[in-house]
């Protein structure tokens, strides 16, 4: 495989050295200005010190300039996501310069070798940017480096080496192996640009994490917790999108970052929001749907600059395909129990009814366990915009079918054979929309009928004004 030589990152194909025709030394990195929406078009190759191609290819010095940086490659060809991203950028920013950084010869190697080449590729990009800065009207502030996987760290090096500060770097699932826990100057970091935003879509706490787990930007967004992406499971991929193996599942999840970014470019009317949270579990509990103090942001291209934040972890749920936007809701449910039946967790579902649409039957995911005689918070999300919420239906499906729960059922039955029934009392549900930040309280229609048992349902409507004042007494006062 070809390897770089010298500080300029020159390339020689050692594999074919004996042939005289193979010893020609060439720059290891090429810059292709995509001049047409036609993905087959060869574009224009730019090189430092050669101004003619800039004129011939109508390089717009005052416009935004995007540099797309691919990652490690097993095939040595540009993957299909590349022209999708190029096309999306052209669609969104019609006057912009879109440059593809072709470092395929240095990326088409053993992963460890490709990692060792990232620095030299970053240097090449920095040299190109330094040269462009010599031109009138070109501003580094208008430069946006978009790096996928290993390319994200290349972007970091470029931002580090360039004279001045690049406007923005977007890291699309930055590579994890050999970068996790690395020194700030040996990976993408917030210091590499005026604004560094990152999408993490393949992080794993067990096994090999293809994407980096640690936050490396000003804002680090973890869609679906940054790990299992909807539509990328083996079941989903076997019958579609040409992904039929574990390798393809990995590819699907890793590449999801690119598609989320493309989505943010082309579906401007359906922007996805992410919410700041300390960890994925807290987000899954529905605790983190606040937009106060810049705690929420658009994802992808539409992300708002937040330079005061560093390594701010943000979360969201998404659909399985474009448009990825979902609508997040926080449900605060105060649960009392008439008959506490041990550790068995109820399997609860909610259906939301809105002015525009109704949701499906949505599971209330129990992240840890339901606390009785306490307020429990849940996160639910819908794929469609329901509009204003009008009412909701809560159903109890009985116990979750795990061996643990079945054993608990049996144990509880043995300990209280005379009273095996279980009952929850839920008087009201407070709902907050993540997208609109609106809060609405829903009450049972009849305060005296607020109990639910397995196999039953309970309906909630918007609370009447003053309902809470009238019903201040606890339903349990006479139960002693």
């Amino acid at each position: 495989s070809p390897v770089p030589f010298g500080p300029e990152g020159r390339l020689e194909d050692k594999l074919h050295k004996p042939k005289a025709t193979q010893t020609e030394v060439k720059p290891s990195v090429r810059f292709n200005l995509r001049t047409s929406k036609d993905p087959e078009h060869e574009g224009c190759y730019l090189s430092v010190g050669h101004s003619q191609p800039l004129e011939d290819c109508s390089f717009n010095m005052t416009a935004k300039t995007f540099f797309i940086i691919h990652g490690w490659t097993m095939s040595g060809i540009f993957e299909n996501w590349l022209h999708k991203l190029v096309s999306a950028l052209h669609t969104r920013e019609k006057d912009a310069n879109v440059v593809v950084v072709d470092w395929l010869p240095l990326a088409h190697q053993l992963y460890t070798d490709a990692v060792n080449n990232t620095r030299v590729v970053g240097h090449s990009i920095a040299r190109m940017l330094d040269w462009l800065q010599e031109k009138d009207d070109f501003s580094l502030g208008n430069v946006h480096l978009i790096g996928y996987s290993l390319g994200a760290h290349v972007a970091g090096y470029a931002g580090n080496f360039v004279k001045g500060t690049v406007g923005r770097i977007t890291g699309l699932d930055p590579a994890g192996p050999m970068f996790e826990g690395a020194d700030i100057h040996k990976r993408l970091s917030p210091d590499d640009a005026d604004f560094v935003d990152v999408l993490h879509t393949y992080t794993r706490s067990f096994g090999l994490s293809i994407g980096i787990q640690m936050p490396v930007g000003h804002i680090d967004i973890y869609p679906n917790g940054g790990d299992f992406q909807p539509g990328c499971g083996l079941n989903d991929v076997l019958g579609s999108i040409a992904y039929g193996t574990i390798t393809e599942v990995v590819k699907c999840e890793h590449e999801r970052a690119v598609h989320l970014f493309v989505d943010s470019l082309v579906n401007q009317d359906k922007p996805s929001f992410a919410f700041q949270c300390t960890d994925s579990n807290r987000f899954k509990k529905g605790i983190c749907l606040s937009c106060r103090k810049n705690r929420c942001n658009n994802i992808g291209y539409n992300a708002k600059k937040m330079r005061k934040k560093r390594n701010s972890k943000m979360y969201l749920k998404t659909r399985a395909g474009m448009p990825f936007k979902v609508y997040h809701y926080q449900l605060k449910v105060h649960m009392f129990s008439y008959n506490n039946s041990g550790d068995t967790q109820p399997t609860l579902y909610i259906t939301l009814y809105g002015s525009n649409a109704d949701s499906q039957n949505l599971p209330l995911e129990i992240v840890e366990k339901i606390e009785l005689n306490a307020t429990n918070t849940f996160l639910v999300y819908t794929e469609e915009d329901l509009g204003d919420l009008l009412k909701m239906r809560l159903t109890w499906e009985g116990v979750a079918h795990s061996w643990y729960n079945l054993w608990n059922e049996f144990r509880n039955y043995l300990s209280q054979p005379s009273n095996p029934s279980r009952e929850l009392y839920i008087r009201r549900i407070r709902v907050k929309s993540g997208e609109t930040q609106r809060k609405v309280t829903f009450c049972t229609q009849d305060p005296t009928k607020s109990s639910i048992s397995p196999g039953q349902e309970l309906w909630f409507h918007k609370c009447q004004d003053g309902w809470k004042m009238k019903n201040k007494t606890s339903p349990f006062v006479n139960l002693a």
């Epitope: 495989s1 070809p2 390339l11 194909d13 594999l15 074919h16 193979q22 020609e24 060439k26 090429r30 292709n32 995509r34 036609d38 993905p39 087959e40 078009h41 060869e42 574009g43 190759y45 097993m74 095939s75 040595g76 060809i77 540009f78 993957e79 299909n80 996501w81 590349l82 022209h83 999708k84 190029v86 593809v100 072709d102 395929l104 010869p105 088409h108 019958g239 579609s240 999108i241 040409a242 039929g244 598609h259 474009m322």
Partner: antibody, heavy 120, light 112 residues
Amino acid sequence: QIQLVQSGPELKKPGETVKISCKASGYTFTNYGMNWVKQAPGKGLKWMGWINTYSGVPTYTDDFKGRFAFSLETSASTAFLQINNLKNEDTATYFCARFSYYGRHYFDYWGQGTTLTVSS
Amino acid sequence: DIVLTQSPASLAVSLGQRATISCKASQSVDYDGDSYMHWYQQKPGQPPKLLIYAASNLESGIPARFSGSGSGTDFTLNIHPVEEEDAATYYCQQTNDDPPWTFGGGTKLEIK
């Protein structure tokens, strides 16, 4: 106009070596990848692999690893296919075909083909 | 590797009629709304010639009587009305992401 012109027919004995050329014109040679495709007599098309015309890095499919070598003479805008230790089953017509690095990788221009006959 | 199965292996169609050739892939060749399936025509003693790219796009200079359709795993090449010069062997090819890229076995079209 864009053309890929291949070298003439070859008659070889088993165990010998052959080198087929494919000269490109009408476009910037290094801006497109070059494929090689085999077609045995009366059979279908079989993709052998491709070469990056800029870096010179070849990629071979599993069936064509070992005796087959893709190479370049960039200054002459020419790609080569060399087959070593020829066998009877190498008797076929070999085509070069270009593809765009940036698009959907279909083969838009083909050489006229070089017929190789391997016989003792 | 993705296997492409063409059917029929050969067909005879009367002048002016419709010829329909099918290509089935062993797994989807779609990617984000695009189908990476292409069709070529090869006449005896000649190299293949690109007719249709990305399932349904007509290559420039190819007559409009050629059309392609399909997505996922099922693709079709239609020729209507068939002309004398269309007698040839037709191949489908997939180039979805990582190689190896593969060709179908070919369909020989004869004009009655």
